[in-house]
Interface confidence: medium
């Protein structure tokens, strides 16, 4: 089954409320447009990053209210017998594909560790995040293309796995995504991505950005 239908709906974060609002706004403005979800998520997170604490406040209030609702409902909720056990995760199920950022990290993490052996895991992650944000979109393309191909493969694999409906069905069919030709990094100056510095033009129905947004 799909879990207990009586179980209270999970609590939403302030960011989740913000994304929900974005989607509703977009639906109103472009009722017929099909949404490119990776692009949508990217734009949402960029907009969220540039918002002031005051602007985020209303979403934080919504999250607080929702948390209170969740806690209130959970007090009276009695889970059905045997539902407390963690859901079985099939080790043979196709693995979720890595994101473009993850692929970028895999390539650059050893370089950072080599150059700065004393850095903590957190600092390495922070540095990787900064490097990614300062890589222009044209130079993100190799990682994005590779991630898109792996995602496509994963979707086929997971569909086949579900169609077979047996936990070990994936054993034969799921081949580790073959390592696609590693991008020979050209040693280039890393530049800010134009859309990092996005300002919102409220009058403007269209939110315009620099050419590196794709």
């Amino acid at each position: 089954g799909k879990g207990d239908p009586k179980k209270p709906r999970g609590k939403m974060s302030s960011y989740a409320f913000f994304v929900q609002t974005c989607r509703e706004e977009h639906k109103k403005k472009h009722p017929d447009a099909s949404v490119n979800f990776s692009e949508f998520s990217k734009k949402c997170s960029e907009r969220w990053k540039t918002m002031s604490a005051k602007e985020k406040g209303k979403f934080e209030d919504m999250a607080k209210a929702d948390k209170a609702r969740y806690e209130r409902e959970m007090k009276t909720y009695i889970p059905p017998k045997g539902e407390t056990k963690k859901k079985f995760k099939d080790p043979n199920a196709p693995k979720r594909p890595p994101s473009a950022f993850f692929l970028f990290c895999s390539e650059y993490r050893p370089k950072i560790k080599g150059e700065h052996p004393g850095l903590s895991i957190g600092d390495v992650a922070k540095k990787l995040g900064e490097m990614w944000n300062n890589t222009a979109a044209d130079d993100k393309q190799p990682y994005e293309k590779k991630a898109a191909k792996l995602k496509e493969k994963y979707e086929k694999d997971i569909a086949a796995y579900r169609a077979k409906g047996k936990p070990d069905a994936a054993k034969k069919g799921v081949v580790k995504a073959e390592k696609s030709k590693k991008k020979k990094e050209e040693e280039e100056d890393e530049e800010d991505e134009e859309d990092e510095e996005e300002e919102e033009d409220e009058e403007d129905e269209e939110e315009e950005e620099d050419d590196d947004d794709e």
């Epitope: 403005k29 490119n36 044209d138 393309q141 134009e194 859309d195 403007d204 050419d211």
Partner: antibody
């Protein structure tokens, strides 16, 4: 509606100079990298120059064929982009287009990009 | 870095035509396709290999495999007669690249 309108084309002699302009409207110009693309009569499209935004220090890039002779610049307060062409050669004869590629709409990519109608530059003695 | 396109292609009205674009960087870079009508107006018809811009007919589709990107036009109409250019970015410190263009003739 988005508009890019080029002006300033004309007939000049080899080794002379000419400055063409592009007036942009209908989008947040200061957030847009701008390009000049040209097309010689009967030939294909060729990227000529690119200028990035203020956060990127208005970095400029040029095709090898025009390096050292052409200068791209912009005035964000006027939503204008310019191409100063010095020491012109007969092979610079072309239709010059101003373009703002790879735009986005709202929060979802529309993939649309904007082109001007072009301005003709003829270099002939 | 070059993008190679066939100089011309022809198709009978209502049929399907494919135009190819080859370049060593295409496994790692996105291909974009432009249509230039006889009046010289330029419109992008495909971006990021296979995405269609808003306002472009769903008769236009794009794909990319290895070093080749392909633009396909199904149910070709007379108004599709135009020059088609592929373009790809190279790396951020260089200008993008255009293919030489393919002149599409619609017969019948």
């Amino acid at each position: 509606a988005v508009q890019l309108v080029e002006s300033g084309g004309g007939l000049v002699q080899p080794k002379e100079s000419l400055k063409i302009s592009c007036a942009a409207s209908g989008f947040t110009f200061s957030n847009a990298a701008m390009y000049w693309v040209r097309q010689a009569p009967g030939k294909g499209l060729e990227w000529v120059a690119r200028i990035r935004t203020k956060p990127n220090n208005y970095a400029t890039y040029y095709a090898d064929s025009v390096k050292g002779r052409f200068t791209i610049s912009r005035d964000d307060s006027k939503s204008m982009v310019y191409l100063q062409m010095d020491n012109l050669k007969t092979e610079d004869t072309a239709m010059y287009y101003c373009t703002a590629p790879r735009r986005t709409e709202g929060i979802v990519s529309s993939g649309v990009d904007y082109w001007g109608q072009g301005v003709m530059v003829t270099v002939s003695s | 870095y070059e993008l190679i396109q066939p100089p011309s292609a022809s198709v009978t009205l209502g049929n399907t035509v494919s135009i190819t674009c080859s370049g060593d960087e295409l496994p790692k870079r996105y291909a974009y396709w432009y249509q230039q009508k006889p009046d010289k107006s330029i419109v992008r018809v495909i971006y990021k290999d296979s995405e269609r811009p808003s306002g472009i007919s769903d008769r236009f589709s794009g794909s990319s495999s290895g070093t080749t990107a392909t633009l396909t036009i199904r149910g070709t109409q007379a108004e599709d007669e135009a020059d088609y250019y592929c373009h790809s970015t190279y790396s951020d410190d260089k200008l993008p690249v255009f293919g030489g263009g393919t002149k599409l003739t619609v017969l019948g």
